[in-house]
């Protein structure tokens, strides 16, 4: 028989979500207004297209990438959309309050929507580690805490370490990965007997996950270049990201075959590894001076991603209770660290080239930034995990993990799924 939400959650979720939405509407009413100075409508359209690319990445790319579970594909896609919609609203307000509010109202521009979409993307990366084990009410809490933590991290990094939009947003990979892993660590882990099949992937959902990976692959250059200041930087970022993800696809598919005793290609490896180059190149995508360097980075990232997908899931499943197919968390954590290391190497090259002690100090600052991002991610992730364990959220019972029928109405299904 198809399972229902418990009554208390049926009362709790709409009340919680709609009250929150009403509060957001009031905040927008009192504290925001649009930028009135748009002279150039052609420029407006071009600027909107970048935001549109980011929305496609978030809604379709990450939505479908996480939909490979046999019995949890609907929830993965729809919950992602729900979190994106809520996250963007809160991120716009939060970024405005943190950066503009002393001067009066928060001015909403296409750039602020772009920033907010990227902040919300952080939640969609993190949630891969917990999807299937939480309900929508819990996800609302996760969105609010993570977007707030990321917004504050970015403000602290901007003010203390003097970094620009791009540099402080590129900590998103490491931040989101460690946040998600620490939330997963707090949630109940063991899958009860008889439900193991639910966290396995199935052919059709796996195909939709591959579709998600393809959308992310196509639009990753837009993500890495969205916040850069000048056309030259954006051009370099687009080219370098494209070369890096192109090479990571080739590496992912051939590396996956190499890693299998019979030379077969693993869908799970490929879903994640095709994006490896984009993550690894993110921090320094606008600085890499020639294509071959971006390509080498894509190759290394692809190998790390396939290697991680082969050897880390066992450990992650035991310690964090993360299913084998949810490899985005540890993948992004490794690749994000690789990206940060590449940037530090570039800082060192500046030191060698200029003989400038100031840049030696910048290396220390860069390591400090990275450490701060990881610490805030772990602390806020643990806080979120503890909050999600509270009884008030009526979390799904472990027997109902990875089950669309807990959340969705399927009129044509009497029994089973």
């Amino acid at each position: 028989m198809s399972s229902k939400y418990p009554r208390s959650v049926r009362r709790c979720l709409p009340l919680w979500a709609l009250t929150l939405e009403a509060a957001l509407i009031l905040l927008f009413y009192f504290f925001t207004h649009y930028d009135a100075s748009l002279e150039d409508q052609k420029g407006l359209v071009a600027s909107y297209q970048v935001g549109q690319d980011l929305t496609v990445m978030a809604a379709i790319g990450l939505g479908f990438l996480t939909s490979s579970f046999r019995r949890h594909s609907w929830s993965s896609v729809a919950f992602n959309l729900f979190m994106l919609a809520l996250g963007v609203q809160w991120a716009i307000l939060l970024d405005g309050f943190l950066s503009q509010f002393p001067s009066g109202k928060v001015v909403i521009t296409l750039f602020s929507i772009r920033l907010a979409t990227m902040s919300a993307l952080s939640v969609l990366i993190s949630v891969d580690a917990v999807l299937g084990k939480v309900n929508l009410a819990q996800l609302v809490v996760m969105v609010l805490v993570e977007v707030t933590a990321l917004g504050n991290l970015r403000m602290v990094i901007s003010n203390i370490f003097n970094t620009d939009y791009h540099m402080n947003m590129m900590h998103i990979y490491v931040f989101a990965a460690y946040f998600g892993l620490s939330v997963a660590w707090c949630l109940p882990k063991p899958l009860p007997e008889g439900t193991e099949d639910k966290d396995q992937t199935a052919t059709i959902p796996s195909l939709s996950a591959m579709l998600g990976a393809l959308f992310l692959w196509m639009f990753w250059p837009s993500f890495n270049s969205a916040l850069l200041r000048s056309p030259i930087e954006r051009k370099n970022a687009v080219f370098n990201t494209y070369y890096a993800v192109a090479v990571s696809v080739v590496t992912a598919i051939s590396g996956s075959s190499l890693a299998h005793p019979q030379g077969k290609i693993s869908k799970t490896y490929v879903h994640s590894a095709v994006l490896a180059g984009g993550v690894a190149v993110g921090t320094s995508c606008h600085l890499i001076p020639s294509p071959w360097l971006a390509m080498v980075l894509g190759l290394v990232a692809g190998l790390i991603s396939v290697g991680g997908a082969k050897y880390l899931p066992g450990c992650c499943n035991r310690v964090l209770g993360i299913p084998h197919s949810s490899i985005m968390g540890y993948n992004f954590s490794l690749l994000g660290l690789l990206g940060e290391i590449i940037y530090i190497v570039l800082l060192v090259l500046d030191t060698v080239g200029a003989g400038n002690g100031m840049i030696g100090f910048q290396v220390l600052l860069s390591i400090g930034e990275l450490s701060l991002a990881i610490v805030i991610a772990l602390m806020s992730g643990l806080l979120t995990g503890l909050l999600l364990n509270l009884k008030i959220w009526k979390a799904p019972h472990e027997a109902k993990y990875f089950d669309d029928q807990v959340f969705w109405k399927f009129p044509h299904l009497a029994v089973g799924f």
Partner: antibody, heavy 125, light 109 residues
Amino acid sequence: EVQLLESGGGVVQPGRSLRLSCVVSGFTFNNYGMHWVRQAPGKGLEWVAVIWFDGSNKYYADSVKGRFTISRDNSKNTLYLQMNSLRAEDTAVYYCARENQIKLWSRYLYYFDYWGQGTLVTVSS
Amino acid sequence: AELTQPPSASGTPGQRVTISCSGSSSNIGSKYVYWYQQLPGTAPKLLIYSNNQRPSGVPDRFSAFKSGTSASLAITGLQAEDEANYYCQSYDSGLSGWVFGGGTKLTVL
């Protein structure tokens, strides 16, 4: 040859508004960030505002925040500065300046490489 | 002005003159310094960028240095046409904007 030509200056009463324009030629306008910088009579330079190449981001000096608005029309190769609630201390020559950049290994540095000749704004009752 | 410069400096032709510029950790201490020359009645012109680099067309008589939260511009072989106002500039992360020095009027005696 790169040229930046400001216009729209004049005498205005406190509390009133004025709109400055800066028409550029000799380079691809939509590839560059642009700034307004002012210089009060007999005083030093003061940065006023910046707008990114595509108009997507703007920053202002604290002294003009909430009163001045920088904008651009890339199709007309024109930069604007809308000045509202003008005060006596806003009296200055206003220059538009082009932002250029230099690339190091680990960062880009931004500076003003070309300036206009300036337009005088006098706020007086 | 957020950056401090001496209001005036002078020298005779052929001499070496130095103009100082002091700031704080939020500007010169952690950011790069630029120098501009403003000849009487004209717009400023870039003289030095990223602490010590000269744009093409600027003679090598102009050089600049930075140490900690201070910077300086040196002009060797002073010439009559160097008589102008000189401004230092940096980005201030605390103010999220560019800051200039008050300017130094250089007189060639």
